[in-house]
């Protein structure tokens, strides 16, 4: 019951996180206008990873997509892979753990398979939501040092008569919803982990030794049997958890949620 | 066709108040940005006011804050500006104006005098 | 605050004749964010209301006379009148729109001979 309940809210976790990775890839507020030195400005500035925005206070925004690939800045362009190899994997991760989650029954998949599909839904969540933390942090530092680098020379002036403010920028909403979204997307992805351990069969835990009356052989049964003796009138071996519904002899077409202590 | 039309200017003495009232049509009010400005005697033109499409955001002149209330009524379609503690030197012809692209004034009303005298 | 200085304070033409009339800035009023200049230019005559005339410095309202054209960026602009009719003795006036207070130059007064 807590392996699936991990494993269920580790899928919700991430998915939110997923959600949210593609809502910052895609927000406009990457960075915007630091309005510290002008706090009235008429003319309001932010960027986004795909296009720019100018909102005037008449009302009117302008936005204007970056229609090059090779004028971009190197660091934009290794943010953006970061964000799109992010979802990429975490889409991916999404739909492996929809097939891994234990309360979807799939044909005669056994657990071992879900546990190994959970662990790599599980690694997927966590390397997107590395990705998406990775991203945002280099675009958050790359913002630092422009900050700084444009106070330095904040006012450039021309005999100290006329004055250029630079247009400083601050970090944006989409940082931080994408600092959020990461950080919830890698929680998914150690909850699916453990959700792992849970739901993987421990074949050493118990062996079972079928002593028959008639003395040919020992059979050692893998799995979650208790050892029983042959003697007396009931010389089938009866599992301990299911009431004796099911003998030994009987073929199990997949494992049933009592198969494991 | 859009028209802005002024009104409720009039002869007060100084520290009076005065409300003036600017009624719009021909377009949707609450997608732009309304302003008021004065032409002073000596005809000077001064921004005295702006507020937002959605009324979230206003801005003043120094000389006028905290004595001037710009705001507006999108259901009647009116703009306002409450003056309070009027000075001689805010005697004007005060304009309502739309804010368009770049911030520009596209449309003004026909404007209504404020005379501050004793 | 930002201060708008027009040049000359009036100009005194003929009918047909080219007219350029400057407005200098204290700050620069081009943005980054669009590479746009937020400087603006009004028409005003007798008893009117001021008419818009150009936006972004050099964007012309729609329904303006093409011969008004505006040019400049940062801190100097030019409105340029390339032939003055009788209908265009007004007022022109230019405005910061880039930063508030919004502040508008003094103005320059073109009148016929």
């Known amino acids: 019951m807590a392996v699936t309940a991990c494993q269920g809210l580790g899928f919700v976790v991430s998915l939110i996180g997923i959600a949210g990775i593609i809502a910052a890839t895609c927000m406009d507020q990457w960075s915007t206008q630091d309005l510290y030195n002008n706090p009235v400005t008429a003319v309001f500035n932010y960027q986004g990873l795909w296009r720019s925005c100018v909102r005037e206070s008449s009302g009117f925004t302008e936005c204007r997509g970056y229609f090059t690939l090779l004028g971009l800045p190197a660091m934009l362009q290794a943010v953006r892979a970061l964000m799109i190899v992010g979802i990429v994997l975490g889409a991916i991760g999404l739909l492996v753990s929809i097939f891994a989650l234990k309360c979807i029954r799939i044909g005669s998949m056994e657990d071992s398979a879900k546990a190994n599909m959970t662990l790599t839904s599980g690694i997927m969540f966590i390397v997107s939501g590395l990705c998406a933390i990775a991203g945002v942090s280099v675009f958050a530092n790359m913002l630092v040092t422009n900050f700084w680098m444009s106070t330095a020379n904040m006012y450039t002036g021309m005999g100290g008569m006329v004055q250029t403010v630079q247009t400083r920028y601050t970090f944006g909403a989409a940082l931080f919803v994408g600092w959020v979204a990461g950080g919830l997307t890698l929680i998914g992805g150690v909850m699916m982990c453990i959700a792992c351990r849970g739901l993987a069969p421990e074949e050493t835990n118990y062996k079972a030794v079928s002593y028959h009356a008639s003395g040919h052989s020992v059979a050692y049964k893998p799995g979650g049997f208790k050892a029983s003796t042959g003697f007396g009138s009931n010389t089938k071996n009866k599992k301990i958890y299911d009431g004796g519904a099911r003998t030994e002899d009987e073929v199990q077409s997949y494992p049933s949620k009592h198969d494991y202590v | 066709e859009v028209q802005l039309v002024e009104s409720g200017g009039d002869l007060v003495k100084p520290g009076g108040s005065l409300k003036l009232s600017c009624a719009a049509s021909?377009?949707?009010?609450?997608?732009?940005?309304m302003s008021w400005v004065r032409q002073t005697p000596d005809k000077r033109l001064e921004w005295v006011a702006t507020?937002?499409?959605?009324?979230?955001?206003?801005y003043y002149l120094d000389s006028v804050k905290g004595r001037f209330t710009i705001s507006r009524d999108i259901a009647k379609n009116t703009l306002y500006l409450q003056m309070s503690s009027l000075k001689s030197e805010d005697t004007a012809m005060y304009f309502c104006?739309?804010?368009?692209?770049?911030?520009?004034?596209?449309?003004w009303g026909q404007g209504t005098s404020v005379t501050v005298s004793s | 605050d930002i201060v708008m200085t027009q040049s000359p304070s009036s100009l005194t033409v003929t009918a047909g004749e080219k007219v350029t009339m400057s407005c200098k800035s204290s700050q620069s009023l081009l943005n980054s964010g669009n590479q746009k200049n937020y400087l603006t230019w009004y028409q005003q005559k007798p008893g009117q209301p001021p008419k818009l005339l150009i936006y972004?410095?050099?964007t012309r309202e729609s329904g303006v006379p093409d011969r008004f054209t505006g040019s400049g960026s940062g801190t100097d602009f030019t409105l340029t009148i390339s032939s003055v009719q009788a209908e265009d003795l007004a007022v022109y006036y230019c405005q910061n729109d880039y930063s508030y207070p919004l502040t508008f130059g003094a103005g320059t007064k073109l009148e016929l001979k």
């Open positions: 021909g377009f949707t009010f609450s997608s732009y940005g």
């Open positions: 972004w410095a050099s």
């Open positions: 507020i937002s499409g959605g009324g979230s955001y206003t």
């Open positions: 104006a739309r804010q368009s692209r770049g911030n520009a004034m596209d449309y």
